[in-house]
């Protein structure tokens, strides 16, 4: 049928919870293409009706929730004007055992459910949540050995759990839990993560480089909205935390009540030798108290600030 076959690695999935897989294969999906999902080489496409438990949502296949019988090979066919690619995804459903203390790690989990913390460092775990825009995700709760994580060494930031001064006791079985809402229905997502520890620097001890800001000032009018990107290059294997702080406090915590100033979601682009990270800070409305205050972008041991200043008066207007 003239389609190129591409085989993705197997995905191990948890029964009784939502799961989604996005059919993207750059640069194929960057142009004008049509994407259709099929199961087990069936000629009948996966339903696009949003009420269906399994349905296609734009380029995604969405399971609400995943069930035992859903194991199998799924194909998404990407058709362009002059091309056709068929991507095969093998999904295997298993019963989750996050609270079974006899299970010392779950060896068949995919890599994003195995994470490493670096002893003596400030590090983080990531709750990988890959869902289409139609899915609304609530706040994330974190658990270790089935107990909710508390304590001043732990901070929840977006999809990450920040762990300060990692110790040997931090290894073990973690889970992140979030409520997903789709078409008015709620579902629980519980991702188990096996967390191991290492003393190795892991990235050769190199220091992340903050490309912008450069300890510079920005002229901005009172009352305006402002978005500033922090651009960082770092090694591919780095474990550095990237965030915005003011008065040595995470901006999301400092402006917790008003939410007037917020940190954005981190994105990254992967290059051959390094990753380029971007994390922005948004001022919904610049206030007088913001001027002259250093807003610090942190990346591991590196830091750089921006300072807001009022524009110089334009005497030509008089």
């Amino acid at each position: 049928d003239g389609c190129n076959d591409i085989f993705m690695k197997n995905e191990m999935l948890s029964a009784s919870q939502p799961f989604a897989f996005n059919c993207t294969f750059p640069p194929i999906t960057s142009g004008e293409v049509s994407v259709t999902w099929y199961k087990n080489s069936s000629k009948i496409p996966v339903s696009k009706i949003i009420q269906s438990r399994i349905h296609q949502d734009e380029t995604w296949i969405l399971f609400l929730p995943m069930e035992w019988g859903d194991s199998g090979v799924y194909q998404c066919v990407i058709k362009g004007r002059d091309s056709c690619h068929r991507i095969h995804v093998n999904l295997t459903v298993f019963e989750k055992q996050w609270c079974d203390t006899s299970v010392k790690g779950l060896p068949n989990l995919s890599d994003e459910y195995k994470q490493i913390l670096h002893l003596g460092k400030d590090d983080s775990l990531t709750c990988h949540l890959h869902f289409p825009k139609s899915c609304i995700l609530g706040p994330i709760k974190w658990y270790k050995d089935c107990n909710e994580i508390t304590g001043e060494r732990f901070t929840v930031l977006e999809t990450r759990l920040l762990v300060s001064n990692v110790s040997a006791e931090d290894r073990g079985n973690y889970a992140c839990q979030v409520i997903l809402t789709h078409s008015g229905k709620q579902y629980e997502v519980l991702n188990g993560i096996t967390v191991s520890i290492t003393e190795r620097a892991g990235y050769g001890g190199s220091v992340p480089k903050i490309i912008y800001p450069k300890n510079n000032s920005i002229e901005v009018q009172l009352g305006t909205t402002l978005i500033v990107d922090c651009n960082i290059t770092d090694t591919k294997d780095n474990t550095n935390l990237r965030c915005w702080r003011v008065n040595n406090t995470l901006v999301d915590d400092y402006y917790n009540e008003s939410k007037r100033i917020r940190e954005g979601v981190e994105t990254h682009a992967s290059f051959r030798e390094y990753n380029l990270y971007t994390v922005n800070i948004t001022f919904l409305e610049v206030k007088m108290e913001d001027y002259g205050l250093p807003f610090m972008c942190h990346a591991g041991v590196s830091a750089a600030y921006i300072m807001l200043q009022l524009p110089a008066p334009d005497f030509r207007a008089y």
């Epitope: 002893l119 040997a168 290894r171 520890i197 290492t198 003393e199 190795r200 090694t235 294997d237």
Partner: antibody, heavy 120, light 106 residues
């Protein structure tokens, strides 16, 4: 059960390149750290280097100018190349990995080792 | 580089003896790892994170220490314990081993 198996020539001529491969079963080399260690005859263990889950490589500075560790994720293998060898590189070479009790540095799984002799 | 010095380099002892092997680091290390190696065999993880015994290691073995001084102790030596023991650190690269302590039957 994680298993590692070294393979490669047992005899290498001086000034040539030593090449060994470690084939892994029971675990994916895209998780954890994958190490090379050698044991000189009648001497102790020497840490050569590792390749990590992301493909990052670390080399012992004493060997850095001569060593390359690479991987082939499709075959679940990682390899060691040591250039410009001399008789001092004669040793039993081991591949090993950790992760025991969630400790990556605890090298619990080892290959059986392969003796490489450098001689003309 | 952190130098790891094991003492003694070799030790003759009898079955039933209490034996202590010391590993001294030239700078502070966070944790110590110990390996047992028998002739013609690959090393085996013996003690990790300074004091934790690996699977299958008898309880007569123990590990302790902090900073620059670490010890492996055998409370009552058994015939199968005769081997070479190595310490290793991961705190600072390069990740150095001690030169080994060869435990022999007296």
């Amino acid at each position: 059960q994680v298993q590692l198996q070294e393979s490669g020539p047992g005899l290498v001529k001086p000034s040539q390149t030593l090449s060994l491969t470690c084939t892994v079963s029971g675990a994916s080399i895209t998780s954890g750290y994958w190490n090379w260690i050698r044991n000189h005859p009648g001497k102790g263990l020497e840490y050569i280097g590792y390749i990590s889950y992301s493909g990052y490589t670390y080399y012992n500075p004493s060997l850095k100018s001569r060593v390359t560790i690479s991987r082939d994720t499709s075959k679940n293998q990682f390899s060691l190349k040591l250039s410009s060898v001399t008789a001092a590189d004669t040793a039993v070479y081991y591949c090993a990995t950790g992760g025991y009790d969630y400790v990556e540095d605890a090298l619990y799984y080892w290959g059986q080792g392969t003796l490489v002799t450098v001689s003309s | 580089d952190i130098q790891m010095t094991q003492s003694p380099s070799s030790l003759s002892a009898s079955v039933g003896d209490r034996v202590t092997i010391t590993c001294r680091a030239s700078s502070n290390v966070r944790y110590m790892y110990w390996y047992q190696q028998k002739p013609g065999k690959a090393p085996k993880l013996w003690i990790y994170l300074t004091s934790n015994l690996a699977s299958g290691v008898p309880s007569r073995f123990s590990g302790s220490g902090s900073g620059t001084s670490y010890t492996l102790t055998i409370s009552s030596l058994q015939p199968e314990d005769f081997a070479t023991y190595y310490c290793q650190q991961y705190t600072t690269s390069p990740y150095t081993f001690g030169q080994g302590t060869k435990l022999e039957i007296k």
